[in-house]
């Protein structure tokens, strides 16, 4: 069964900087990539970066840069520049739409006591559907 | 097809409130982020600040902070912008927009609306 | 806040021939440019983003290029309904417009 893990990790240089990092575990292409935060993608949560493999990619305010790390990851980079929430307590959610699989999605958040630095380990945590 | 409908020209008076809507029509309302945008009369394009409707996050420009309030009505896929205490520096087309995503930014625009300060 | 610094600020051509514009950013902007037409008591209309990706249904004229913070917008074989005011947008970092060209036909 594919699954999708989540990593979001605190920069040790900079502590309003933020990273998430998202994978996808399982065979099949990525067609597109979704990151939101305060929820998953269509249940309540705001879209922070789409990814895609031809099209490109797009992200909005915090989030200042998303990439491909390799064909099934990526990482999202957000700055805390007084957004309407603090990073340190937010979902973080990844939805990778994958053929012919469809979608997962998993979501993750900074652990209360993570140090600079340190990330949240890569569990995956699936999380409402899989379409 | 995609739709953006705004409501119609307002005249108010200076240190009045005024609330623009814009209703979408043709996709799904949740999945966009609507951008809010100011023309001043025979001047360039400012943009105001953008709304996420599937989660009600707001981001503005510093310029218009205290100035614009962005909401929505997800029930009757409607975006409003709420201006107050209005002064002729006010004075107006407002458009709204929809941030298309990799479909690029502001992709489908609504007509406008002229808002007009004065005593 | 990114500055974006657009030129010129009109200009005028002949029907069938070609027009550049140019915007240049405070800083580098990472291909995050979109181009609009805005005629007289209308809404802009989007021609091409991320520098040079054309809109479905925009004519094969018009084009752009550009990196960094430099980027240019063309229109080739000029045609009358091109009169119109032209705009770019960056949006790299929120989104800031630059100041407008007016196209005139000679």
């Known amino acids: 069964t594919p699954e999708v893990w989540v990593q979001v990790q605190m920069e040790a240089t900079e502590l309003s900087s933020f990273t998430v990092h998202c994978g996808f575990l399982g065979p099949g292409s990525i067609s597109l990539v979704t990151v939101s935060w305060g929820g998953p993608d269509g249940a309540g949560g705001t879209k922070l970066a789409v990814l895609h493999p031809e099209l490109g990619t797009r992200q909005w305010a915090p989030a200042r840069q998303a990439r491909w790390e390799t064909q099934s990851s990526i990482s999202l980079a957000l700055e805390d520049s007084g957004a309407s929430s603090p990073f340190a307590n937010t979902t973080f959610c990844c939805k990778f739409a994958s053929f012919p699989e469809g979608s997962w999605e998993s979501c993750g958040s900074l652990p209360p006591s993570s140090d600079p630095g340190l990330s949240a380990p890569p569990t995956p945590v699936p999380i409402l559907r899989a379409d | 097809q995609v739709q953006l409908q705004q409501s119609g020209p307002e005249l108010v008076k200076p240190g009045a409130s005024v609330k623009i809507s814009c209703r979408s029509s043709?996709?799904?309302?949740?999945?966009?982020?609507i951008n809010w945008v100011k023309q001043r009369p025979g001047q360039g394009l400012e943009w105001i600040g953008w709304?996420?409707?599937?989660?009600?996050?707001?981001y503005y420009n510093e310029k218009f902070k205290g100035k614009a309030t962005l909401t929505v009505d997800k029930s009757s896929t409607t975006a409003y912008m709420l201006l107050s205490s209005l002064t002729s520096e006010d004075s107006a087309v407002y458009f709204c927009?929809?941030?298309?995503?990799?479909?690029?930014?502001?992709?489908?625009w609504g007509q406008g609306t002229t808002l007009t300060v004065s005593s | 806040d990114i500055q974006m610094t657009q030129s010129p600020s009109s200009l005028s051509a002949s029907l069938g021939g070609k027009v550049t514009i140019t915007c240049k950013a405070s800083q580098d902007i990472n291909k995050y440019i979109a181009w609009y037409q805005q005629k007289p008591g209308k809404g802009p209309r989007l021609l091409i983003h991320?520098?040079?990706t054309l809109q479905p249904g925009i004519p094969s004229r018009f084009s752009g290029s550009g990196s960094g913070r430099n980027s240019s917008f063309s229109i080739s074989n000029l045609e009358p309904e091109d009169i119109a005011t032209y705009y770019c947008?960056?949006?790299?970092?929120?989104?800031?417009f630059g100041g407008g060209t007016k196209l005139e036909i000679k």
């Open positions: 709304i996420f409707p599937g989660s009600d996050y707001t």
């Open positions: 043709g996709y799904t309302f949740t999945d966009y982020y």
């Open positions: 927009a929809r941030d298309g995503g990799l479909r690029g930014p502001f992709d489908y």
């Open positions: 947008l960056q949006y790299d970092n929120l989104h800031t």
């Open positions: 991320y520098t040079s």
